[in-house]
């Protein structure tokens, strides 16, 4: 049953997407198995999930990579859930890390983000890695998503 | 607080069981610490939580694994969250693969999965991993649960 | 929109803290972006949060760690989330294992732990780890929280 | 390029039993749901079972209900059906499917198709 009008349910899950860009934001996609709950939250230019309301929200992140410790740098994978609100910088929310696998030609890897956060209006929420060439787009491999509480 | 009879809080979190099926889809017990708010949720069969009510909900499942390169498949260890709604094939939800440990005898490792997701009356959801048999059982690694916005 | 004075929001999210303590129970603190609602959940002794109400909450943890596996003993890395309820004895909730890395001079691994539980008044909630010196206190690295549902 | 090779088919008498395989490549196949159809000789195509992408969900025609069982191995990328109690009406060349999309209705359509294989059900 919806929270009535004045109180709806607010909540996103999207996709991963391969991306030809060589940023380390990841790009993510309504496809699949995704949720956009109203227009309260919105997916803006594949790449943040933005928020209309101020509140409390749990916001999640999943990305499994393949990387190997030779083909790559000596610096872990890292996963970034990051945070920018109108008029100020960026701010990272949460970190996870993993070395790089010695498997050939590479080594599967899943990391899982999440927590609980004030968010303001207009405030939007991504995600950044440090090798987006890595990160694995096979079907439910790599999503994000929140939800109000 | 509850929301009152009209939208009651719908919440299961349950442990995992070892067996000695074949079955690669895992098995679950209401044991231990575990959560069944009522009966908008029930375990079924011991291996999937089916809901009664429609809406979203938050959906995870944790899962702890021991293994060793050597004496695994060339493939990574994969778990899969997966949703059975009636009269259609399962679908993935959620994945997420941890290459295998060269540590002898076997090296354990966690994989956190969770996400956003409608479900529809009756529909269930699962967990499938590549090798029950890997899995652990001791108390808090394996785990399997679910909350209703 | 909070929920009304009734059933207010109630959630929490705090930030790793290193210790001098040899205590293998994680420190943390109201720092950076934490979140603390009001005072029905409670960061207390930098070591556990404590809610004033009976109900369901989701509690999770992330903890990253860095080691290496000819430095470390044999075991693998545990974290775990324990409850301990007024008179009687802690007991784990949940808990994640990742053997230790090849890597040198030590190799980042993150464990996410997250689950729906029953809490009574009074009850705590805190995060035990098998070496906290190896756990990484970089800025989003290491959290802990919960919400109410 | 997505491939299905089928194997196992052959000679058997009434009362026997085969099993078929279908090994798959050039697509991620624990994703798919996956299913079995046949021709008999001067017939059209006739569903014979499905199975969802990991194994929970497995639908079989009312003709071979409690005789064939159809299941796969992920790690192999392989399809299977055990054909028991065979009969001479299940004379047939089977081929081995793929559904063109990842969740949906058992009666929905396949996307790609194997060669076949020959299973002769004769005395």
């Known amino acids: 049953m919806q929270k009535g009008d004045q109180n709806p349910q607010i909540a996103a899950h999207v996709i991963s997407e391969a991306s030809s860009k060589t940023t380390s934001v990841l790009q993510w996609a309504e496809k699949g198995y995704y949720t956009m709950s109203n227009n309260l939250v919105t997916l803006e230019n594949g790449k943040q999930l933005t928020v209309k309301r101020q509140g409390l929200y749990y916001i999640y992140a999943q990305v499994t990579f393949c990387s190997n410790r030779e083909a790559s740098s000596q610096a872990p994978f890292i996963a970034s859930l990051c945070l920018k609100s109108p008029g100020r910088f960026e701010r990272i929310l949460l970190r996870a890390a993993n070395t790089h696998s010695s498997a050939k030609p590479c080594g599967q890897q899943s990391i899982h983000l999440g927590g609980v956060f004030e968010l303001q209006p207009g405030a939007s929420v991504f995600v950044n890695v440090t090798d987006p060439s890595q990160v694995s787009h096979g079907t439910g491999f790599t999503s994000f998503g929140l939800l109000k509480l | 607080m509850q929301k009152g009879d009209q939208n009651p809080q719908i919440a299961a979190h349950v442990i995992s069981e070892a067996s000695s099926k074949t079955t690669s889809v895992l098995q679950w017990a209401e044991k231990g610490y575990y959560t069944m708010s009522n009966n908008l949720v029930t375990l079924e069969n011991g291996k999937q939580l089916t809901v009664k009510r429609q809406g979203l909900y938050y959906i995870y499942a944790q899962v702890t694994f021991c293994s060793n390169r050597e004496a695994s498949s060339q493939a990574p260890f994969i778990a899969s969250l997966c949703l059975k709604s009636p009269g259609r094939f399962e679908r993935i939800l959620l994945r997420a693969a941890n290459t295998h440990s060269s540590a002898k005898p076997c090296g354990q490792q966690s994989i956190h999965l969770g996400g956003v997701f409608e479900l529809q009356p009756g529909a269930s959801v699962f967990v499938n991993v590549t090798d029950p048999s890997q899995v652990s059982h001791g108390t808090g690694f394996t785990s399997f649960g679910l909350l209703k916005l | 929109m909070q929920k009304g004075d009734q059933n207010p929001q109630i959630a929490a999210h705090v930030i790793s803290e290193a210790s001098s303590k040899t205590t293998s129970v994680l420190q943390w603190a109201e720092k950076g972006y934490y979140t603390m609602s009001n005072n029905l959940v409670t960061l207390e002794n930098g070591k556990q949060l404590t809610v004033k109400r009976q109900g369901l909450y989701y509690i999770y943890a992330q903890v990253t760690f860095c080691s290496n596996r000819e430095a470390s003993s044999q075991a693998p890395f545990i974290a775990s989330l324990c409850l301990k309820s007024p008179g009687r004895f802690e007991r784990i909730l949940l808990r994640a294992a990742n053997t230790h890395s090849s890597a040198k001079p030590c190799g980042q691994q993150s464990i996410h732990l997250g689950g729906v539980f029953e809490l009574q008044p009074g009850a705590s909630v805190f995060v035990n780890v098998t070496d906290p010196s190896q756990v990484s206190h970089g800025t989003g690295f290491t959290s802990f929280g919960l919400l109410k549902l | 390029e997505v491939q299905l090779l089928e194997s196992g088919g052959g000679l058997v008498q009434p009362g026997g039993s085969l099993r078929l395989s279908c090994a798959a490549s050039?697509?991620?196949?624990?994703?798919?749901?996956m299913g079995w159809v046949r021709q008999a000789p001067g017939k059209g195509l006739e569903w014979v079972s499905s199975?969802?992408?990991?194994?929970?969900?497995?639908y079989y025609a009312d003709s071979v209900k409690g005789r064939f069982t159809i299941s796969r191995d992920n790690s192999k990328n392989t399809l299977y059906l055990q054909m028991n109690s065979l009969r001479a009406e299940d004379t047939a060349v089977y081929y081995c499917?793929?559904?063109?999309?990842?969740?949906?209705?058992?009666?929905?359509?396949?996307?790609?198709w194997g060669q076949g294989t020959l299973v002769t059900v004769s005395s």
């Open positions: 199975i969802g992408p990991v194994g929970m969900s497995t």
């Open positions: 050039g697509f991620t196949f624990m994703d798919y749901p």
């Open positions: 499917a793929k559904y063109g999309g990842t969740s949906g209705r058992h009666n929905t359509k396949f996307d790609y």
